[in-house]
Structure formats: structure tokens, C-alpha cells
């Protein structure tokens, strides 16, 4: 009886070969079967199971004029670019009837120089702070065994001697490359080389010098950077008036950031042109030539409260009768800091001068008692905040008094709603 | 592990019909020869039919035209479509899968063919 219609008797004349070969490779496997009647699909099986996608192809020949006779059917496989997960037991499969038939095994198998599945990457580290670095390769053939390098020097006697897919480096206190080297049977493959660029650690206890109402003197500790001296520290302040509440270590604030270099050595800074009596947040990062340290975290600073910059305005003085009425208007000049209220002083002619603190009103009626004669009678006024007092005014002239008046000036004046303080003018 | 789940069994009149589903979610019946068997009381495993990963089918004489094997890969589910059905159809009806290929010949009538079975599903034809 023909090939293929007795049971147990297999139909395939030709089985898959072997294919050994490296990463990349493109091989076929081929078989080939011999059956009487119409040609059966052949399906390939790996590790014994059914390959749905397999990239083959089927011609098949007849023996003979009459579709009962026998037929020659040949299904080529082909393996592009060979992968670990193209190893394995290959066989065809042909359903005739009720029956399966599989075909004599061959095997494909991965054999070549060792390939990576974790390569070391570039980074960048603070100078003497340890880190780890990852490599990892595989064969077939196996072992695999791993050599790493430090700027080209072996750090291991032999490969499989040292570190193998996880190196430690302890610090470096310059930048270096580092790769690592995959030995097996087949021989040596070589990862890319990563460089481990070294940068200086972030400064240290920042921390305020001084403060002035529109200035802060602001120090720091410099981190070590390796063999690079540093080169310039970046100092940025923001304003956190906003609710913002900006927490060490959280993202950087949405406002512009004011930016102050700073040479070095000293690691000292004066940043003006602040506000007075304004909260901000302050941070560092100094620079070598190989890149930036990381920012110090944000520290909250505040400048002090000022005197305001300059004097009322405005400044009116009249009498009617027996009184005095003396008004003006909050400086315009920035008051650096919360406005506590305002200073008087008055003085005559060869009479001392006399001091009133007015408080927040800014007008006040000064009663004249008895009838005396002070000539020259002048009136100042200064805007006060905790801070101090802020600059006087020009004097202002009051009406010289009716002659033939004997008493003092500080007696002639009199402020009823408020008590009157008085101490001489420095 | 792969786990197979017949449906659709029941009772049903003499030339009444009935469709089985057998289902699985942990491997593909496209890659797969799944066949149906069935049992009756006190009887061995009978065959029934199968389908091949290529679309082949084959049927038990006993079935062949009431019967219809499909297979809906969408779904990864078989179907057996039984029409005609008479009492001696009467069974526990099993779905049964084979992934797995090795030894160089097999009947694929056999159930000892097969590495995954469904629970069965019951059909009972009255007269």
C-alpha cells in the first residue's frame, strides 16, 4: 500500500535537520512527506506544540496523472534572525483522516558570543557618594562569565573573579568609565561604556549672616567635588508670601526665582534688592566643570521690618485763635514695614523742642493757653514702624505768636486727647 | 493551567436539537485539535468528532450530518450543533483539547489522544 494509508506507518520521507548558530542568523528547516490522495496541510510544532504564525511555505508534486496517486508535498520553515526564543525541538504534523503524524525531531539551539540583556548606563553622582552599576549577559553556550572595567583597567584578576551583574562603587572622586565584559566558550563581547560624570554634593547648612531690611547675608558649607574645584555657587531666592508653603525637598516654586552667582571661595552671598519684612525661601547649588551639585533644600528666611524712606507729605499748619491745627498724609515713600503711627515735634525760638507721638491719626489741634509771644513756632512730623523712626519732615511755620507773651512754648500748647511726651530731639 | 467548560446540555425531545459550547480562556483553540466525545451510562468514551487547528473536521459515523463541529477563535470557544438528536444520543457529552504533539503516530479518535477534558454536560433526548 502507498505511504500514508497504513496505520502506524509514517508518511514523512524527509525530517527537519539541526541549525546551531549565533544571534541574527536565518536558517530553514525543511520536510518532506510522501501520501496518496489529496496532499494534507503540514503544521510545524515547537517543543511539541503547534506553531500558529510559522513563516513557511508548502509545494507539493504529483507522482501521477490521477488524484489517487501519490503526491510529494515538501514544507519549508524559515528561522529569521535567530533568537533564544527560536530554540527548541522542531517536527512537522499532518492530520490524514483521524491520524496524526509528526515527523523525526531536529533541533535549532543558540550558540555564539555572549549577549547583553543589561548594559551599564551613564549617570551622574555626587563626588565620594557609593552608587551601583548593572550588566547582565547571556549564551547560550553558558556560563557567561563577567569582567568590568574602570577607565579600561580590569577590576577583577580573571572573569567570574569579581563582581558579576551588579558592581559597587564605593565613591569616586573623579569622572570614569566604566564597562563590562562578557567572556564564554564562543569568546568576548563588550558592553557600551558607560561615563559616571562626578559633580560636587549639595552644600551644606545654609544658613543667614545677617539681615537688613532689603538684604541677607547668606552663608554655606561647600560639599566635596572630587578633584574639580568649584568653579561658582548659584544662589536662588523666591518669595513665599503666597500660602505657597514651599517643603523641603517639594518641586521648585511657579514663580520666577531671583538668581544670584556667587565666586568662591568665600561661600558668602549678600542678595539684595529684597523687600523689607518679606518672607522668602532660599537655596543653593555650587558647580565645579563637570555640572551642577544637586539644590540644597528650600530654607525659609525672612527680612527684617525697615524705617519708612521717607517723610510725610503734605504738611499743613494754621492757627485760628487759640489753636493750632497741624494735618498730613502717609509718606509716600516705601514704609518698609507695618506703619505704627506718626511723631510731632515743635520748637520756638530759643525755646527747647518739644515731642508728641500722634499715633495712626494724621491730624491734630494743638490748644494755645495764655497769651505769649514765641516767634518762629516750627512744626515737624516722622512716620514710625517697630523698626524706628523715618526721616523728618522740613519744618513748617506756624504764625508768629502776639508780642508781650511771657511763658513757655510747651506751656502756651496744649494736645488735650493725647498726653504729650516730651524729651529733647537727638 | 488550562481549564475547559462544556454548556448547553439539557433535556430535549426526540428530532429536537441542542447546541454545546465548550470554552476556555487560558490557551487558544486555534492552535489546538479539540474534539467532542460522549458517555452513556455504563459505556465507554465514545468519540464524536474533532477539528484541527486548521479547520479540519471528522465525524463518528454514528453523527455524521445531524452533527456540526465550529469553532470561534474570537471567542476561543467550540460549538457542537446537534440536530435530529434521537434517544440513543443520550450522554454526558465532553469537550476535550490536545496542544501537545510528540510521538509520531496518534488516532485522534482515541481519547487517551487528548491532555484537557471539560466537566461534561448531560443531554438527555426523551422519546
Known amino acids: 500500500a502507498p505511504r500514508g494509508t497504513q496505520a502506524e506507518e509514517s508518511p514523512f520521507v524527509g525530517n527537519p535537520g539541526n541549525i546551531t548558530g549565533a544571534r541574527g542568523l536565518t536558517g530553514t528547516l525543511r520536510c518532506q512527506l510522501q501520501v496518496q490522495g489529496e496532499p494534507p496541510e503540514v503544521h510545524w510544532l515547537r517543543d511539541g506544540q503547534i506553531l500558529e504564525l510559522a513563516d513557511s511555505t508548502q509545494t507539493q508534486v504529483p507522482l501521477g496523472e490521477d488524484e489517487q496517486d501519490d503526491w510529494i508535498v515538501v514544507s519549508q520553515l524559515r528561522i529569521t534572525s535567530l533568537q533564544l526564543s527560536d530554540t527548541g525541538q522542531y517536527q512537522c504534523l499532518v492530520f490524514l483522516g483521524h491520524q496524526t503524524f509528526v515527523s523525526q525531531p531536529g533541533y535549532v539551539g543558540l550558540e555564539g558570543l555572549p549577549y547583553f540583556l543589561e548594559e551599564p548606563e551613564d549617570r551622574t553622582v555626587a563626588a565620594n557618594t557609593p552608587f551601583n552599576l548593572s550588566c547582565q549577559a547571556q549564551g547560550p553556550p553558558e556560563p557567561v562569565d563577567l569582567l568590568w572595567l574602570q577607565d579600561a583597567v580590569p577590576l577583577a584578576t580573571a572573569p567570574g573573579h569579581g563582581p558579576q551583574r551588579s558592581l559597587h562603587v564605593p565613591g569616586l572622586n573623579k569622572t570614569s568609565s566604566f564597562s563590562c565584559e562578557a567572556h564564554n566558550a564562543k569568546g568576548v563581547t563588550t558592553s557600551r561604556t558607560a561615563t559616571i560624570t562626578v559633580l560636587p554634593q549639595q552644600p551644606r547648612n545654609l544658613h543667614l549672616v545677617s539681615r537688613q531690611p532689603t538684604e541677607l547675608e547668606v552663608a554655606w558649607t561647600p560639599g566635596l567635588s572630587g578633584i574639580y574645584p568649584l568653579t561658582h555657587c548659584t544662589l536662588q531666592a523666591v518669595l513665599s508670601d503666597d500660602g505657597m508653603g514651599i517643603q523641603a525637598g517639594e518641586p521648585d516654586p511657579p514663580e520666577e526665582p531671583l538668581t544670584s552667582q556667587a565666586s568662591v571661595p568665600p561661600h558668602q552671598l549678600r542678595l539684595g534688592s529684597l523687600h523689607p519684612h518679606t518672607p522668602y525661601h532660599i537655596r543653593v547649588a555650587c558647580t565645579s566643570s563637570q555640572g551642577p551639585s544637586s539644590w540644597t533644600h528650600w530654607l525659609p528666611v525672612e527680612t527684617p521690618e525697615g524705617v519708612p524712606l521717607g517723610p510725610p507729605e503734605n504738611i499743613s499748619a494754621t492757627r485760628n485763635g487759640s489753636q493750632a491745627f497741624v494735618h498730613w498724609q502717609e509718606p509716600r515713600a516705601p514704609l518698609q514695614g507695618t506703619l505704627l503711627g506718626y511723631r510731632l515735634a515743635y520748637q520756638g525760638q530759643d525755646t527747647p523742642e518739644v515731642l508728641m507721638d500722634i499715633g495712626l491719626r494724621q491730624e491734630v489741634t494743638l490748644e494755645l493757653q495764655g497769651d505769649g509771644s514765641v516767634s518762629n513756632l516750627t512744626v515737624c512730623v516722622a512716620a514710625y514702624t517697630a523698626a524706628g523712626d523715618g526721616p523728618w519732615s522740613l519744618p513748617v511755620p506756624l504764625e508768629a505768636w502776639r508780642p508781650g507773651q511771657a511763658q513757655p512754648v510747651h506751656q502756651l500748647v496744649k494736645e488735650p486727647s493725647t498726653p504729650a511726651f516730651s524729651w529733647p530731639w537727638w | 493551567q488550562v481549564q475547559l467548560v462544556d454548556s448547553g446540555g439539557g433535556l430535549v425531545q426526540a428530532g429536537g436539537s441542542l447546541r454545546l459550547s465548550c470554552a476556555t480562556s487560558?490557551?487558544?483553540?486555534?492552535?489546538?485539535?479539540m474534539a467532542w466525545f460522549r458517555q452513556a451510562p455504563e459505556k465507554v468514551r465514545d468519540f464524536v468528532g474533532f477539528i484541527t487547528n486548521s479547520g479540519n473536521i471528522l465525524y463518528d459515523d454514528s453523527v455524521k450530518g445531524r452533527f456540526t463541529i465550529s469553532r470561534d477563535n474570537a471567542q476561543n470557544t467550540v460549538y457542537l450543533q446537534m440536530n435530529s438528536l434521537k434517544p440513543e444520543d443520550t450522554a454526558v457529552y465532553y469537550c476535550?483539547?490536545?496542544?501537545?504533539?510528540?510521538?509520531?503516530?496518534?488516532?485522534?479518535?482515541?481519547?487517551?489522544?487528548?491532555?484537557?477534558w471539560g466537566q461534561g454536560t448531560q443531554v438527555t433526548v426523551s422519546s
Open positions: 487560558t490557551r487558544t483553540v486555534s492552535s489546538a485539535v
Open positions: 476535550a483539547a490536545k496542544w501537545s504533539f510528540s510521538s509520531g503516530y496518534g488516532d485522534l479518535r482515541r481519547a487517551a489522544m487528548y491532555d484537557y
